[in-house]
């Protein structure tokens, strides 16, 4: 058993049929010694008396808010949550496996630049009695500070018969050094509590590996005289690291109709302009990627050909 | 060329060669996302690798103030990786595929280090750690880790030379 926060405790249980469970001793936070009784949740049934209460925690019915009283007055509370371990593996029931970029990916994180700011998000089908707490650091043995905000519900989607909820959090490294080569990864830890179930999820990454630039901005077309060709120009996204002579991007320019199966024109360039062939009912799209490190491409920025 | 005395390097040549190094490093180990190397206990491998750190002057302001600190750091790293790529970690079993870009990568690391430091001038270099994995599978894992680390190192070096070529060239 360990303390998650004040008056909230996590009991770690091996979860299998007829498991013996964990013996837990609760102590009433009071100077009083006599006349103390214990109850669980809203029940008035007295579970025991005395300054300490010893219980055998085996299942969710044994978890909950234990309260010690004296003469009708509440003295203190202890909330017990369960953390299940099945076949040596901690349960991951609360969050959905996003399966990208690999199986058992529960947290996904992205950064728009090298400033040390990043966003993480996760998915669940649970809509109520759900809380999240996020901590982060650079490195684990001698951790350096990363400050995370509160996790918020950022999207709701309908997936078949189920509703899916997306939560996200923004974090900022306290003393970021955008030009340095990272040697210690960022660690992100999410505590998830659903009713009386506790789970924790972690992710470890370098900012350089989660970079995904915003799409290029200000796409403009200039038809070339006596030609089917069009000069397309664009600018670096505002959110990308500066100066651009140092933090350079490379670009992919594509002309394609509405369907992915249609024919296309495609060219790669390090410049902020390119010449392509425009077709009626097609769009010109441009996306960006770090020029020197193969992290994710941005989403496409598009303009119609006509 | 960047000599210890402080003259300027051939920024454009260094830019071209460092960008080539980036391409080669990713060709040598493209399957980056397919193996989470941090799960394999990185400390003993990459702790000894020379990283370009915050105080090394490789940021745009540091380069403007005095590029020598940064260039020396890059030079150290190039020599370090060049030696690693020439060591039995890469030459031993399992043999690299003959079409592996590691050979070109090795040569290009040497080429860029020579551009930065002509013969006759000597910056102190970092000792190569004695990493002699006994098992072929350990050697394979070590190769992946080294190439991953090299990708990050050459990306910073390429940014430095691109910025230098754009803003510090005579």
């Amino acid at each position: 058993i360990w303390e998650l926060k004040k008056d909230v405790y996590v009991v770690e249980l091996d979860w299998y049929p007829d498991a013996p469970g964990e013996m837990v001793v609760l102590t009433c936070d009071t100077p009083e010694e006599d006349g103390i009784t214990w109850t669980l949740d809203q029940s008035s049934e007295v579970l025991g008396s005395g300054k300490t209460l010893t219980i055998q925690v085996k299942e969710f019915g044994d978890a909950g808010q234990y309260t010690c009283h004296k003469g009708g007055e509440v003295l203190s509370h202890s909330l017990l949550l369960l953390h299940k371990k099945e076949d040596g593996i901690w349960s991951t029931d609360i969050l959905k496996d996003q399966k990208e970029p690999k199986n058992k990916t529960f947290l996904r994180c992205e950064a728009k630049n090298y400033s040390g700011r990043f966003t993480c998000w996760w998915l669940t089908t649970i809509s109520t009695d759900l809380t999240f707490s996020v901590k982060s650091s650079r490195g684990s043995s001698d951790p350096q500070g990363v400050t995370c905000g509160a996790a918020t519900l950022s999207a709701e989607r309908v997936r078949g018969d189920n509703k899916e909820y997306e939560y996200s959090v923004e974090c900022q490294e306290d003393s970021a050094c955008p030009a340095a080569e990272e040697s210690l990864p960022i660690e992100v830890m999410v505590d998830a509590v659903h009713k009386l179930k506790y789970e924790n999820y972690t992710s470890s990454f370098f900012i350089r590996d989660i970079i995904k630039p915003d799409p290029p901005k200000n796409l403009q077309l200039k038809p070339l005289k006596n030609s089917r060709q069009v000069e397309v120009s664009w600018e670096y996204p505002d959110t990308w690291s500066t100066p651009h002579s140092y933090f350079s991007l490379t670009f992919c320019v594509q002309v394609q109709g509405k369907s992915k199966r249609e024919k296309k024109d495609r060219v790669f360039t390090d410049k902020t302009s390119a010449t392509v062939i425009c077709r009626k009912n097609a769009s010109i799209s441009v996306r960006a990627q770090d020029r020197y490190y193969s992290s994710s491409w941005s989403e496409w920025a598009s303009v119609p050909c006509s | 060329r960047a000599v210890p005395g402080g003259s300027s390097p051939a920024w454009t040549q260094c830019q071209q060669l460092s960008q080539k190094l980036c391409t080669l490093a990713w060709s040598a180990h493209p399957l980056v996302g397919h193996m989470d190397l941090r799960e394999e206990g990185d400390e003993e491998t990459t702790n000894d690798v020379p990283h370009i750190q915050c105080g090394d002057g490789c940021d745009p302001q540091g380069l403007r103030d005095n590029s020598q600190f940064c260039l020396q750091r890059i030079h150290q790293g190039l020599i370090f990786y060049e030696k690693l790529l020439g060591s039995d970690i890469f030459t031993g079993e399992p043999s690299l595929l003959p079409d592996s870009p590691v050979g070109q990568l090795h040569a290009s690391l040497l080429g860029l280090s020579q551009l930065l430091q002509p013969e006759g001038h000597h910056w102190e270099t970092q000792q190569i750690p004695s990493l002699s994995p006994s098992q072929p599978w350990q050697r394979l894992l070590l190769r992946f880790k080294i190439l991953r680390s090299l990708q990050a190192f050459v990306a910073v070096a390429a940014r430095v030379f691109a910025h230098g070529a754009a803003t510090l060239s005579p």
Epitope: R228, T250, K263, K264, R266, V267, D270, T275 | -
Partner: antibody, heavy 118, light 107 residues
Framework: EVQLVQSGAEVKKPGATVKISCKAS????????LHWVRQAPEKGLEWMGW????????EYAPKFQGRVTITADTSTDTGYLELSSLRSEDTAVYYC???????????WGQGTLVTVSS | DIQMTQSPSSVSASVGDRVTITCRAS??????LHWYQQKPGKAPKLLIY???QSISGVPSRFSGYGSGTDFSLTINSLQPEDFATYYC?????????FGGGTKVEIK
């Protein structure tokens, strides 16, 4: 199977015009760009131009501008190359090539030898 | 026009050898570079597109690499059917241009 079948060899006099055909099969003709590339004896490859069969848009290499016409007939799934004012240095194998991507060539015809000789 | 220079113009090699052909562009072309194989009396065949992307059905012994102005095609463990002429082609800008070709001959 995507295939391009070209018309047979031609012998032409200098100053004449040649028209070669390229019949597509195994795909929707207008879904691919069609290019023409030539190769002089013992020489390298030289791109001449392309057509989008869907709308008839064309682009020619400056070297051939004014002398070359590329057309496409969607009713017969056939592309054509017409080269006028022939000279001896136009003696070459002419290939049609197609792809969904405009700038490189995925599928090739077998080639048509055009000999220009007086 | 962008000039593409291939080297060597010919190379003699034996079955099992590793052969590397290089292609240099007269200006930077990013990764807009493609490789073809041509056998005598036959049409060219696409091997690699956008510098390093492999084509399904093309043996994995063919690999491409490069960016900017310098590119290479490597044939690892040359097979009897690989004796042919190889061409690079840039697609950075029109007109599309090819290298002069590299003939891989039997030693």
């Amino acid at each position: 199977e995507v295939q391009l079948v070209q018309s047979g060899a031609e012998v032409k006099k200098p100053g004449a015009t040649v028209k070669i055909s390229c019949k597509a099969s195994g795909y929707t003709f207008s879904d691919y760009y069609l290019h023409w590339v030539r190769q002089a004896p013992e020489k390298g490859l030289e791109w001449m131009g392309w057509i989008d069969p869907e709308n008839g848009d064309t682009e020619y290499a400056p070297k051939f501008q004014g002398r070359v016409t590329i057309t496409a007939d969607t009713s017969t799934d056939t592309g054509y190359l017409e080269l006028s004012s022939l000279r001896s240095e136009d003696t070459a194998v002419y290939y049609c090539a197609a792809n969904k991507e405009l700038r490189y060539f995925d599928v090739w015809g077998q080639g048509t030898l055009v000999t220009v000789s007086s | 026009d962008i000039q593409m220079t291939q080297s060597p113009s010919s190379v003699s090699a034996s079955v099992g050898d590793r052969v590397t052909i290089t292609c240099r562009a007269s200006q930077s072309i990013s990764i807009n570079l493609h490789w073809y194989q041509q056998k005598p009396g036959k049409a060219p065949k696409l091997l690699i597109y956008f510098a390093s992307q492999s084509i399904s059905g093309v043996p994995s012994r063919f690999s491409g690499y490069g960016s900017g102005t310098d590119f290479s095609l490597t044939i690892n463990s040359l097979q009897p059917e690989d004796f042919a002429t190889y061409y690079c082609q840039q697609s950075n800008s029109f007109p599309l241009t090819f290298g002069g070709g590299t003939k891989v001959e039997i030693k």
